[in-house]
Every structure is written in C-alpha cells, then in structure tokens.
C-alpha cells in the first residue's frame, strides 16, 4: 500500500515523497482534480488511473502490501503474492520511474498547489 | 518424479502443539521462486490454505489462524514444517503439503503436486 | 477475505451428458483453477488459469468464466469423472477454496 509506495519513490527518485510529491500539482496526493500541470502531474494523474482499474478489479489499493527487490536502480515486483499486490507494485513502479523521468521539469511551486486552482476538464482514464 | 509425504502425531489433546513434517523429493526449495503449502481437509470447513514458505525463506499465513502457526523449513533436507499451537478439535482434519507450481504467469499461484496427506485427530 | 461459492453442491450425470459446475467469487477474482479429488486421493490439479487443461486432462474438460462468475464444463460425462471438485483463487490475499461440488455417475 502506501508504504510501499513511498518507500519505492524514494529510493528510484532520491527524493522524500512526504516533501516532494504528496501533495504537489492538482493529482499528486490524495484525491486530483483538474487538468495536470506538468508531466510531474500527469505521472501521478496516471497513477491514479491505474489505482482506479485495480480498485474496480476488487483490490484493496491502500491495506495489499507487496513484496518487491530494488537493486541497481530498478525495481523487481515479486511474483511471491497475490494478483492483486503484483499488479499494485506495478502501478507503483510506473509511477516512481515516471517521477524520476521528469525530475529535470519538477517545480517547487507546484508543491503544495492550492488544489482550489486545479481547474479545466480532469483527464479520463 | 516430484513427491511430497506429511507425516504427523495421528491423535493429540486439546491445547497440545500440533507439528508436521512435509519430507519431498524431485525439486529444491533453495531453486528461486519454488515454495510449498499446507493445506487441510476437513468435513466441517473444506479445503482451507494455511500456511506457505518460499525458497528464501518468506513466509505467508491465513489471518485467520497466524497467531497460531509457524511455517519452517529444512532446505538441505528437503523439509518443510508446520506448528499449529492451542489446538482444538476443529483442528481435526487430513493435512497436506503442497508445492506451488512454477508458472510462466508470475501472477499463477496454484498446486500442481499434492502429498497424500496425514490425518490429525483432536480430542478434547 | 474472498469467498467462492460452488453450485451444486452434489449432482449426478449420466454418462454422455454435459455437465457444467459453477464458481461464484464474493467479489471480482482475475482467475480461477480448478481441482479434482476422488475419495481417499488427495487434490489434483485440473484447471489452471481459468481455461487451460492440466498435463493429463482429457480435451472433454473446459474451464470459462471472468469477474465472479466461473465454471468448469465436460462436454460428455465418463465414469471416471466422478469427484469431487474444487475452484481456488489467489486474486487477493489469502488464498480461498471453494466447498466442493461432488459429482456422481447416474
């Protein structure tokens, strides 16, 4: 769950989840709304997406925690558990390179973003 | 050929430690991704998973039933074992282990060799 | 914890006829495997990853389904297909059994 997925975040990007990224833009953090600010955004806009699939699949995104390996800067999802805690560790993969492929953009005044001002059509999924 | 063999006590009294030993032969549970089960058959609940350990030693248990069972293992010997501790007379039922089978789909988690099984009576 | 409900619990086929078992998840399972038993053996595996056969399994054997509602069908029932069958899942954590369906020769 969301232990995971900090712990996985910090060690692919190098940076503090709690400080960097939750809340940042108008989709990183609980909830999202609006149109994406920057590809920073849209990674966790994308995330969220792939959460939603998986809640619809049954899977309970927040209480599954996974087993995964990271070593050489990459992430191994276990095959040890069930379905639903592989696919999750591969949300969460996705979103941890997708972060760390966008660091050379990431602003630090979007950190925090007042979510009032997250406005425009929210992407569908 | 793979084979797995449960051996067991065959009657015990309530609140006594239930162990059983899985003797197996034909694979390695030092091989990665390899792991085995116990499952027990009984008339009253079914088929009901319990326990299982992987070839590194990670361990998974029905919540259910964790804070009373321990999951081991002897790799050298081909050994797995199983401690059910405060047993009662639910716990009378066929105990089986079982092998995980090795799936191209990580995501497959099924049995594909099954021991004969060792009944375990409980009397209270 | 997810719960699998097999219907019916016993039936009785002549030989020749199709006979379907169901497998009815609590909530939505990717997959479903199937197991024979026939009294005094243990478990056998039958059908794995909702659809394919087991080595060894005869072609009259199919397994379908998807979300919570799966099944195993023989198209023609023989004599040596009286068991007892169980659906498993491992789409969440634990890993569930069905009760079993027994299936008797007329």
């Known amino acids: 769950g969301i232990l995971n997925l900090n712990k996985m975040v910090k060690q692919v990007t190098g940076k503090m989840p709690i400080l960097s990224y939750w809340p940042y833009g108008c989709h990183c953090g609980l909830g999202g709304r609006g149109q994406p600010k920057d590809a920073t955004d849209w990674c966790c806009q994308t995330h969220d997406c792939c959460y939603d699939h998986l809640k619809t699949q049954g899977c309970s995104i927040y209480k599954d925690y996974y087993r995964y390996n990271f070593s050489q800067g990459n992430i191994h999802c276990s095959d040890k558990g069930s379905w639903c805690e592989q696919q999750l560790c591969a949300c969460d993969k996705e979103v941890a390179f997708c972060l760390k492929r966008n660091l050379d953009t990431y602003q630090k005044r979007l950190r925090f973003y007042w979510r009032p001002h997250c406005r425009g059509q929210t992407p569908g999924c | 050929q793979v084979t797995l063999k449960e051996s067991g006590p065959g009657i015990l009294q309530s609140s006594q430690t239930l162990s059983l030993t899985c003797s197996f032969s034909g694979f390695s549970l030092s091989t990665s991704r390899m792991g085995v089960s116990w499952i027990r058959q009984s008339s009253r609940k079914g088929l009901e998973w319990l326990a299982h350990i992987y070839w590194d030693d990670d361990k998974r248990y029905d919540p259910s039933l964790k804070s009373r069972l321990t999951i081991s293992k002897d790799t050298s010997r081909n050994q797995v074992f199983l401690k059910i501790t405060s047993v009662d007379t639910a716990d009378t039922a066929t105990y089986y282990c079982a092998r995980r089978a090795l799936s191209d789909y990580g995501s497959d988690f099924y049995f594909d060799v099954w021991g004969t099984g060792t009944t375990v009576t409980v009397s209270s | 914890q997810i719960v699998l409900t097999q219907s019916p619990a016993i039936m009785s086929a002549s030989p020749g006829e199709k006979v379907t078992i169901s497998c009815s998840a609590s909530?939505?399972?990717?997959?479903m495997y199937w197991y024979q038993q026939k009294p005094g053996s243990s478990p056998k595996p039958w059908i794995y990853?909702?659809?394919t056969l087991a080595s060894g399994v005869p072609a009259r054997f199919s397994g379908s389904g998807s979300g919570t509602s799966y099944s195993l069908t023989i198209s023609s029932m023989e004599a040596e297909d009286a068991a007892t069958y169980y659906c498993?899942?491992?789409?969440?954590?634990?890993?569930?059994f069905g009760a079993g369906t027994k299936l008797e020769l007329k």
């Open positions: 498993q899942q491992y789409h969440t954590y634990p890993l569930t």
């Open positions: 909530s939505i399972v990717s997959y």
């Open positions: 990853r909702t659809s």
